[in-house]
């Protein structure tokens, strides 16, 4: 008789999840000499320990702390790029601008990027059929709590000028409910962070509006200012040209506004 299994609203654990995490860990530690000391089997054990045998709607930050401990990594605190709803461009940027880092350029972010996982209460099984959806089921699910935990620590580590890339094509350019809006903004440390600089990425070729005047950007400015952090904003009218100019800053066309 097949055992009854909780049916959640979200997709199940990514197939070959354990193998993927382990393989990503090995690859990352080979590419990044400063992380060569990391024991990937121990990292997987700690990752697994955070959600296996636990109810997938009752995961806490505490559950992930052993993984955080093993994945502790020092990135230059003044070279942090946050992003919201524009992950691909942010990653393309840090692939070119190698001295800047998104969360997914760190070991823990790299391990979990684009993956889904959850377990079942009181069994050592991984649930490949379905996992809780943040809205329809519960917010304290393994994936959401993981990103909340790593995002909080990433933001806490930031210093000097912190950059954030925002999607100017969205109705809410700054969304208080995004990970950036609900976690990272509130965990920047005013005693370390001088300025948050927003880069608003335009979508349309002919879009010449000043999106830094958008009401949601003003809301972000207000939140940041109340935290005693300065705020600045730049429009990136041509993201393709922006990336090209990061690659080739000497190009004559790169002196004009992008």
């Amino acid at each position: 008789v097949p055992r009854w299994r909780q049916q959640w609203s979200g997709p199940g654990t990514t197939k070959r999840f354990p193998e993927t995490v382990l393989a990503r860990c090995v690859k990352y530690t080979e590419i990044h000499p400063e992380m060569r000391h990391v024991d990937c089997q121990s990292v997987w054990d700690a990752f697994k320990g955070a959600f296996i045998s636990k109810h997938p709607c009752n995961i806490t930050e505490e559950d992930y702390q052993p993984l955080m401990k093993l994945g502790t990594q020092t990135v230059p605190c003044n070279k942090i790029l946050l992003w919201s709803r524009i992950k691909d461009l942010a990653h393309q940027f840090t692939q070119v601008q190698r001295d800047m880092f998104t969360l997914e350029d760190t070991l823990l972010g790299y391990l979990a990027d684009d993956l889904t996982w959850c377990g079942e209460f009181n069994t050592s099984k991984i649930n490949y059929q379905s996992c809780p959806d943040w809205r329809k089921d519960c917010s304290n699910n393994p994936v959401s709590v993981f990103w909340k935990t790593v995002s909080r620590r990433f933001a806490e580590a930031a210093c000097d000028v912190v950059h954030v890339m925002l999607n100017g094509s969205r109705s809410k350019i700054f969304d208080k409910n995004s990970t950036f809006g609900s976690v990272e903004v509130h965990n920047l440390q005013p005693e370390k962070v001088q300025t948050l600089e927003a880069w608003v990425i335009h979508g349309g070729r002919e879009d010449s509006r000043d999106l830094c005047q958008d009401p949601t950007i003003k809301e972000l400015e207000s939140i940041i200012s109340k935290r005693n952090i300065q705020f600045s904003c730049k429009n990136i009218y041509r993201p393709d040209k922006f990336l090209q100019c990061v690659k080739n800053p000497e190009d004559s066309s790169c002196t004009s506004e992008i």
Epitope: H37, D39, Q41, S42, D45, A46, G49, E61, E62, Q65, P66, M68, K69, L70, T72, T149, R152
Partner: antibody, heavy 119, light 107 residues
Framework: EVQLLESGGDLVQPGGSLRLSCGAS????????MSWVRQAPGKGLEWVAD????????WYADSVKGRFTISRDNSENTLYLQMNSLRAEDTAVYYC????????????WGQGTTVTVSS | QSVLTQAPSASGTPGQRVTISCSGS??????VSWYQQLPGTAPKLLIY???ERPSGVPDRFSASKSGTSASLAISGLQSEDEADYYC??????????FGGGTKLTVL
């Protein structure tokens, strides 16, 4: 019966060295993180060092960093603490403790071994 | 200086309920455990993972956690509960840290 038994405590001069051992029995030693915790006379508990289950990761209190080394031999079910450049303030009872699922708590403690640093 | 703060002493009469508190910013995102140390003996785990009791620990001992503080409650106080009580958690560097300890006297 689950047990931890420390040994190696002694009277040593400042600047000297000492190696503490902790033998484990009654559980799968190689599955668990282990810690050293100390208690100076009349004082509270102070965490000293941690080691991961496979021995590949170690962590130290700032007060002992660079002087103490935690290690383990999983084939012998033994935890070690190598203590160099000892100071008077290292005088304490040293306990080894088993970590329950990383960060749940320290669920098994040894009886402690006394280290006295004095000239 | 411990990043977990405990009152140095507490007292109660037999049968009474006493509460020992522990506070510190790192408690918010880390599990809290509690230890009892009877005079001249090694510490013993009383509470793990914020509020759970290991087998063998009487249900007179209970614990809770909220925000940056945690507390241990002992109901039906007995003379053999006279001991030092320590809270522990991981700190912001994810290393163990103990509170300064609370000496419980049964009057």
């Amino acid at each position: 019966e689950v047990q931890l038994l420390e040994s190696g405590g002694d009277l040593v001069q400042p600047g000297g060295s000492l190696r503490l051992s902790c033998g484990a029995s009654g559980f799968t030693f190689s599955d668990h993180y282990m810690s050293w915790v100390r208690q100076a006379p009349g004082k509270g508990l102070e965490w000293v060092a941690d080691i991961s289950a496979r021995g590949s990761n170690t962590w130290y209190a700032d007060s002992v960093k660079g002087r103490f080394t935690i290690s383990r031999d999983n084939s012998e079910n033994t935890l070690y603490l190598q203590m160099n450049s000892l100071r008077a303030e290292d005088t304490a009872v040293y306990y080894c403790a088993k970590n329950w699922n990383y960060n749940y708590g320290m669920d098994v403690w040894g009886q402690g071994t006394t280290v006295t640093v004095s000239s | 200086q411990s990043v977990l703060t405990q009152a140095p002493s507490a007292s109660g009469t037999p049968g009474q309920r006493v509460t020992i508190s522990c506070s510190g910013s790192s408690i918010q995102n880390n599990y809290v455990s509690w230890y009892q140390q009877l005079p001249g003996t090694a510490p013993k785990l009383l509470i793990y993972r914020n509020f759970e009791r290991p087998s063998g620990v009487p249900d007179r001992f209970s614990a809770s956690k909220s925000g940056t503080s945690a507390s241990l409650a002992i109901s039906g106080l007995q003379s053999e509960d006279e001991a030092d009580y320590y809270c522990a958690s991981w700190d912001d560097s994810l290393n163990w840290v103990f509170g300064g300890g609370t000496k419980l006297t049964v009057l």
